[in-house]
Amino acid sequence: EINGSADHRMFSFHNGGVQISCKYPETVQQLKMRLFREREVLCELTKTKGSGNAVSIKNPMLCLYHLSNNSVSFFLNNPDSSQGSYYFCSLSIFDPPPFQERNLSGGYLHIYESQLCCQLK
Amino acid sequence: EINGSADHRMFSFHNGGVQISCKYPETVQQLKMRLFREREVLCELTKTKGSGNAVSIKNPMLCLYHLSNNSVSFFLNNPDSSQGSYYFCSLSIFDPPPFQERNLSGGYLHIYESQLCCQLK
């Protein structure tokens, strides 16, 4: 089962940027992962399969990302103080059925004077 | 000249650990770099040259480190809340002469509930 409890590994930091990892079960084959800041969608990534099992990736908001078989990581470069907010991931599962939508891990990311700090609530 | 002002690039974060970078001038050939938390030495790295200009590295506290021609980076894994303290680097220059000892960049690193946060004072 996918739950919405805070995952302390959601955030990691890399020289002025933040990587936000959104986990999903390895059994999921086709999905949409969205990263929210408060109510705003910052990033969206859709993974589907086409004929011959070819994977199709749709990244309409042109976010930097890394996709593995159990997570989508979005990279936010040089986040500013306006990004000291609550972040969470939202997962839509297309395959295997049934179709599901779940809000996943969430955490509070606070920026001090261009420094990266992370406090999970 | 080496000064002790806070360097906002001193800290960077990597999946539950913190990288603390201690800069030094590229002209320095032989040196000892120590990382302090308050008055406690956490890490120490000495780079010297021997016969045939072979580089010797001494790392008595077995810290994870990365050495470049202008910085020593120490990696602290899973820092706990007791490490919400003032960190600074201390540089001893052996070569070129004269022998010098300098306290370098310092910054305040605060940990919230095992998450890594960084606020430079």
Epitope: - | T46, T48, S56, K58, F94, P96, P97
Partner: antibody, heavy 124, light 108 residues
Framework: EVQLVESGGGVVRPGGSLRLSCVAS????????MSWVRQAPGKGLEWVSG????????DYSDSVKGRFTISRDNAKNSLYLQMNSLRAEDTALYYC?????????????????WGQGILVTVSS | EIVLTQSPGTLSLSPGERATLSCRAS???????LAWYQQKRGQAPRLLIY???SRATGIPDRFSGDGSGTDFTLSISRLEPEDFAVYYC?????????FGPGTKVDIK
């Protein structure tokens, strides 16, 4: 207070062997590179050999290369000089000397602390 | 090896006078890896100057070093009675590390 105390000197015949020791106190011994420097009676100073903090780097003057071996035991705060195939010209007061910087190297460093010296006499 | 030549061999001066000692290297001593030591009879050498011009810990400021490349000098601005001794230059640039033959500063 830093102290370096040499021992093991004496009179030996040409071709013989001696092992000099230098024990350090009042210092974190493995922070320092060490050297042996000798002084023949009434003469000047001659660097003999050097060793870095962990013994991984050693060097010798041409006059003793292949005959003398420098080593150290950090657990015992001790520096050694094994002298084989001794010659009359090896007769001297032998000093152990510590690297000034605490760099762990004997290379590109001057010497600040010296022992009081130990006399080695090679004579038939 | 780098051969160091010191001059003069002996310097006879009175307390209060200035002493200037010379050390010449057979080839350039890079990065100023040159030191000066003082040795009194029956004692171990004492580091005075390193890096050609930097005073070692506890050395009075009447001692100063200068020079680069192949020519170096040690100056004692006003000789004190305890300064009468033998002075050696030492290059630690290139192995084998070498010392000069020494300059004896004695009382006139």
């Amino acid at each position: 207070e830093v102290q370096l105390v040499e021992s093991g000197g004496g009179v030996v015949r040409p071709g013989g062997s001696l092992r000099l020791s230098c024990v350090a106190s009042g210092v974190t011994f493995d922070d320092y590179g060490m050297s042996w420097v000798r002084q023949a009676p009434g003469k000047g100073l001659e660097w003999v050999s050097g060793i870095n903090w962990n013994g991984g780097d050693t060097d010798y003057s041409d006059s003793v290369k292949g005959r003398f071996t420098i080593s150290r035991d950090n657990a015992k705060n001790s520096l050694y000089l094994q002298m084989n195939s001794l010659r009359a010209e090896d007769t001297a007061l032998y000093y152990c000397a510590r690297d000034f910087y605490g760099s762990g190297s004997y290379y590109h460093v001057p010497f600040d602390y010296w022992g009081q010296g130990i006399l080695v006499t090679v004579s038939s | 090896e780098i051969v160091l030549t010191q001059s003069p061999g002996t310097l006879s001066l009175s307390p209060g006078e200035r002493a200037t000692l010379s050390c010449r290297a057979s080839q350039s001593v890079s990065r100023s890896y040159l030191a000066w030591y003082q040795q009194k009879r029956g004692q171990a050498p004492r580091l005075l100057i390193y890096g050609a011009s930097s005073r070692a810990t506890g050395i009075p400021d009447r001692f100063s070093g200068d020079g680069s490349g192949t020519d170096f000098t040690l100056s004692i601005s006003r000789l004190e009675p305890e300064d009468f001794a033998v002075y050696y230059c030492h290059q630690y640039d290139m192995s084998p590390f070498t010392f000069g033959p020494g300059t004896k500063v004695d009382i006139k």
